[in-house]
C-alpha cells in the first residue's frame, strides 16, 4: 500500500508521497534522494485508456486510475535507483550506485538441503511475525481515509507476510457501492485478464525483497513447487516443509508444523462488502487445507500433468480477445487455468494454476484468502517460472498484451493495484534473468513426456 511516511494528514491532503532519503538540512530537503541525484518528485503517470465495459462503475472505486485517488505525486528514480524514496536499487542491481549486477536462483523446494528447507520455513515464519518496516495498510476507503474527525489517518501496521496477503485481497475485493447496496463482484485487478502473470510476478518480487531485507541476506530466494506431477498427493505437505495433514482434523495442518500456528487475515468478507470497510491486520482462524480432498469435484483431486506445462508453452500468443477468463489460444488464460492446456477455452475446465489452488481444497482455494496458505508462494513461483520460459521462447512478445479495453486494471500500462511505488504491467513483462535479477533452476518437460512403466 503506502509508505509509513506518507500515511499522514499532510501527505494525503497534498497528494504528494515523496519521502526524504537523507534529509541533512531538515524535512523535505532530500525528497527522493534528489540531493544525490537519485531521483525527483514528479507527477504520477496513470493509465487513462478505456477498460472493457464489464466494469460499469467508473468513479466508485479507489483502484481506478491507481493510485490517483490517494496520491498524484511520487518519486521518479533515475537509472537503476528505485524504491519509495529512491533509496534502493532496481531488481537485479546492488551497490551504493546501483551499478553492480546480481542474480539470485529460485530452486525447487524439494531439491533444497535439509538446512536450506529449514531456513526457508523459519524465514516465512519470521515474515509472518515481523512488522513491515516500510508499508502500512489502509483500513478505510479514500473518502474515509482521514477518519471521522478528518484528522486521523486510517492506516495500520501489518506483518511482512500479512502485507503480502493484504495486497492480494485488495486487488480482488468487490467494489463497494454504498451501504444497503450489493457490492459489485465482477471486478478483479489481478486475475482473469492479461495482468494475471505480471501482477503475481511483482507480488512475489516484493515479498522476496522484503524477506531479503528482513534476513539481511541478498541471496535469499523464494523456491518453487513443481505442482505438475499428475499426482493426487501434495509432495511438499510434510512437516519439514509446508506441513502435513493433522491427525485430529483432516482439514487442518499438523501441529508438528509451524504453519499450524498461523492465523489468517482478510476473512471477514461480510463486513467489508456490507460496511465498506477494508481488511485490517486482525488475524482470525487457522489455515484450512485438505489436499485432494474435494470428493464433490473429482476433477480437482489430481494435480496437473507434466505434459500440461509442455503443452501450454506451445501457445504462442500471450493473450487474445476478450482478454478475460474465456479467452481461447491465450497463453495467459491457459497457464492461469481457465483453458485446457492446449489453449482451448472450456467453461468446465480448471487446469494448471487454478487446478493447483483448487486441489489444496481450503484456504488456498479461495481467491480472497489464498495467500494465507504459504503454499501460495511456491505455487506462484512455479507459475512465474512457466511465464518466464514463455517470455524466453517468444522473445517477450508484448504485442498481444492490450493497451486498452482489457478488464479494468489489466491494460498494459496500468499501475498494478495496490503496489507502491507505482509499477506497470509492462515493467514485469521482461525476462527475469536479464532484467529482474533472478533465474529458475528448472528442467522443462518435452511434449513427448511419458511416465515410465
Amino acid at each position: 500500500q503506502f509508505p509509513r511516511q506518507c500515511a499522514t494528514v499532510e501527505a494525503l491532503r497534498s497528494g504528494m508521497c515523496c519521502p526524504d532519503l537523507s534529509p541533512v538540512s531538515g524535512p523535505g530537503t532530500d525528497r527522493c534522494g534528489s540531493s544525490s541525484g537519485r531521483g525527483r518528485c514528479e507527477a504520477v503517470t496513470a493509465d487513462s485508456r478505456p477498460h472493457s465495459p464489464q466494469y460499469p462503475h467508473d468513479g466508485r472505486d479507489d483502484r481506478e486510475v491507481w493510485p490517483l485517488r490517494f496520491f498524484n505525486r511520487t518519486c521518479h528514480c533515475n537509472g537503476n535507483f528505485s524504491g519509495h524514496n529512491c533509496g534502493t536499487c532496481r531488481p537485479g542491481w546492488r551497490g551504493a550506485a546501483c551499478d553492480q549486477r546480481v542474480l539470485i536462483v529460485r530452486r525447487n523446494l524439494l531439491d533444497l538441503s535439509k538446512e536450506e528447507k529449514n531456513h526457508f520455513v523459519r524465514a516465512l515464519d519470521m515474515a509472518k511475525r515481523t512488522t513491515h518496516p516500510l508499508f502500512v495498510i489502509a483500513t478505510r476507503r479514500s473518502e474515509e481515509i482521514l477518519g471521522p474527525d478528518g484528522n486521523t489517518p486510517q492506516f495500520e501496521n501489518i506483518s511482512i507476510y500479512n502485507y503480502f496477503v493484504w495486497t492480494h485481497y485488495y486487488s480482488v475485493k468487490k467494489t463497494f457501492l454504498g451501504v444497503g447496496q450489493e457490492s459489485f463482484g465482477e471486478v478483479d485487478f489481478s486475475h482473469e485478464g492479461p495482468a494475471f502473470l505480471t501482477w503475481h510476478r511483482y507480488h512475489l518480487l516484493r515479498l522476496e525483497k522484503d524477506m531479503q531485507e528482513m534476513l539481511q541476506e541478498p541471496s535469499f530466494s523464494l523456491p518453487y513447487w513443481n505442482f505438475a506431477t499428475g499426482k493426487n498427493v501434495c509432495d511438499i505437505c510434510t512437516d519439514d516443509l509446508m506441513g502435513s495433514r493433522s491427525n485430529f482434523d483432516s482439514t487442518l495442518i499438523s501441529p508438528n508444523s509451524v504453519f499450524s500456528q498461523w492465523r489468517v487475515v482478510c476473512d471477514s468478507l461480510e463486513d467489508y462488502d456490507t460496511l465498506g470497510t477494508l481488511c485490517n491486520s486482525t488475524e482470525d482462524g487457522p489455515i484450512r487445507r485438505n489436499p485432494a480432498g474435494n470428493v464433490a469435484r473429482p476433477m480437482v483431486q489430481r494435480l496437473p500433468e507434466p505434459q500440461d506445462v509442455a503443452q501450454c508453452l506451445e501457445v504462442g500468443l500471450f493473450d487474445t480477445p476478450p482478454f478475460y477468463s474465456n479467452s481461447t489460444n491465450s497463453f495467459r488464460n491457459t497457464v492461469e487455468g481457465y483453458s485446457d492446456p492446449t489453449g482451448k477455452y472450456d467453461p468446465a475446465v480448471r487446469s494448471l494454476h487454478n487446478l493447483a489452488h483448487l486441489f489444496l481444497n481450503g484456504t488456498g482455494g479461495q481467491t480472497h484468502l489464498s495467500p494465507n496458505d504459504p503454499i501460495f508462494v511456491l505455487l506462484h513461483t512455479f507459475t512465474d517460472a512457466v511465464f518466464d520460459e514463455w517470455l524466453r521462447r517468444y522473445n517477450a512478445d508484448i504485442s498481444t498484451f492490450p493497451l486498452e479495453n482489457a478488464p479494468i486494471g489489466h491494460n498494459r500500462q496500468y499501475n498494478m493495484v495496490p503496489f507502491w511505488p507505482p509499477v506497470t504491467n509492462t515493467e514485469m513483462f521482461v525476462t527475469a534473468p536479464d532484467n529482474l535479477g533472478y533465474t529458475y533452476e528448472i528442467q522443462w518437460p518435452s511434449r513427448e513426456f511419458s511416465v515410465p512403466e
Epitope: 533509496g87 551497490g95 535469499f220
Partner: antibody
Framework: EVQLQQSGAELVRPGALVKLSCKTS????????LHWVRQRPDQGLEWIGW????????VYDPKFQGTASLTADTSSNTVYLQLSGLTSEDTAVYFC??????????????WGQGASVIVSS | CIQMSQSPASLSASVGETVTITCRAS??????LAWYQQKQGKSPHLLVY???TLADGVPSRFSGSGSGTQYSLKISSLQTEDSGNYYC?????????FGSGTKLEIK
C-alpha cells in the same frame, strides 16, 4: 562517538551458561543489526549470528543454533549473548559488532573490545 | 553455505613492499565482501567493504578488488603497523562466514 562496550571476562564451569552484554552508545541500536563473532585461542573468526533490536528477530549460524541466544534491551541500548551447555570448545573471546545496512553495505563497521570466556572445571 | 578460502595462511614482507591476500568464495558473492585487520589482542578493524570501498580513515595504500568468486586485498608501501591478521567475510548468504585468516609479518 560510536562505542560498543562489552562485559568483563567470565570463568564458568562445563555445562553451565553465561550471558555476555554489549552496551552501545553513539547510535540508536534500533537502526542497526547487531552481530556476534567468536574467536577461539589462536584461531580465526567465527560468525555466530545477528539480532535486529528493533523487533527481536534473530538468525544464527546452524552450528550455534540451540546453544547461542541473542536478546536486546532497546531501553538501555544493550544486546546480550547467552551461551548454554558450555564445553571447553567454547573457550574464546566473543565480540559484538554492528552492521550498517544502508545500501546493503557489506561490513561490520564497529566492534566491541571482546569478552573472554573460559570454560574450565 | 558459502565457504571462504583465504590464502596465504601467512606471509612475511619488508617495509615498502607490496603484498596481496586473496579470498576465494565457493560461489558468486557479488562483491558482498569485507576485509578486516586484527592486531594481537585487539578487536578486528574494518578496512574495506563492498569488496572495493575503503572504510573511513583507512590509508589509501590498502585497496580491495575482485568480483564473482575471486577477491583480493592489496597493501602497497608496507608499514610496520600493518602487521597482524587479515580476514575476509562475505555477506551474500547466511551464514556470513569468514576466511581462515592471513598472518602478515613485517620483516
Amino acid at each position: 562517538e560510536v562505542q560498543l562496550q562489552q562485559s568483563g571476562a567470565e570463568l564458568v564451569r562445563p555445562g553451565a551458561l553465561v550471558k555476555l552484554s554489549c552496551k552501545t552508545s553513539g547510535f540508536n541500536i534500533k537502526d542497526y543489526f547487531l552481530h556476534w563473532v567468536r574467536q577461539r585461542p589462536d584461531q580465526g573468526l567465527e560468525w555466530i549470528g545477528w539480532i535486529n533490536p528493533d523487533n527481536g528477530n534473530t538468525v544464527y549460524d546452524p552450528k550455534f543454533q540451540g546453544t547461542a541466544s541473542l536478546t536486546a534491551d532497546t531501553s538501555s541500548n544493550t544486546v546480550y549473548l547467552q551461551l548454554s551447555g558450555l564445553t571447553s570448545e567454547d573457550t574464546a573471546v566473543y565480540f559484538c559488532t554492528r552492521r550498517d545496512y544502508t545500501y546493503e553495505k557489506a561490513a561490520l563497521d564497529y566492534w566491541g573490545q571482546g569478552a573472554s570466556v573460559i570454560v574450565s572445571s | 553455505c558459502i565457504q571462504m578460502s583465504q590464502s596465504p595462511a601467512s606471509l612475511s614482507a619488508s617495509v615498502g613492499e607490496t603484498v596481496t591476500i586473496t579470498c576465494r568464495a565457493s560461489g558468486n558473492i557479488y562483491n558482498y565482501l569485507a576485509w578486516y585487520q586484527q592486531k594481537q589482542g585487539k578487536s578486528p578493524h574494518l578496512l574495506v567493504y563492498d569488496a572495493k570501498t575503503l572504510a573511513d580513515g583507512v590509508p589509501s595504500r590498502f585497496s580491495g578488488s575482485g568480483s564473482g568468486t575471486q577477491y583480493s586485498l592489496k597493501i602497497s608501501s608496507l608499514q610496520t603497523e600493518d602487521s597482524g591478521n587479515y580476514y575476509c567475510q562475505h555477506f551474500w548468504s547466511l551464514p556470513f562466514t569468514f576466511g581462515s585468516g592471513t598472518k602478515l609479518e613485517i620483516k
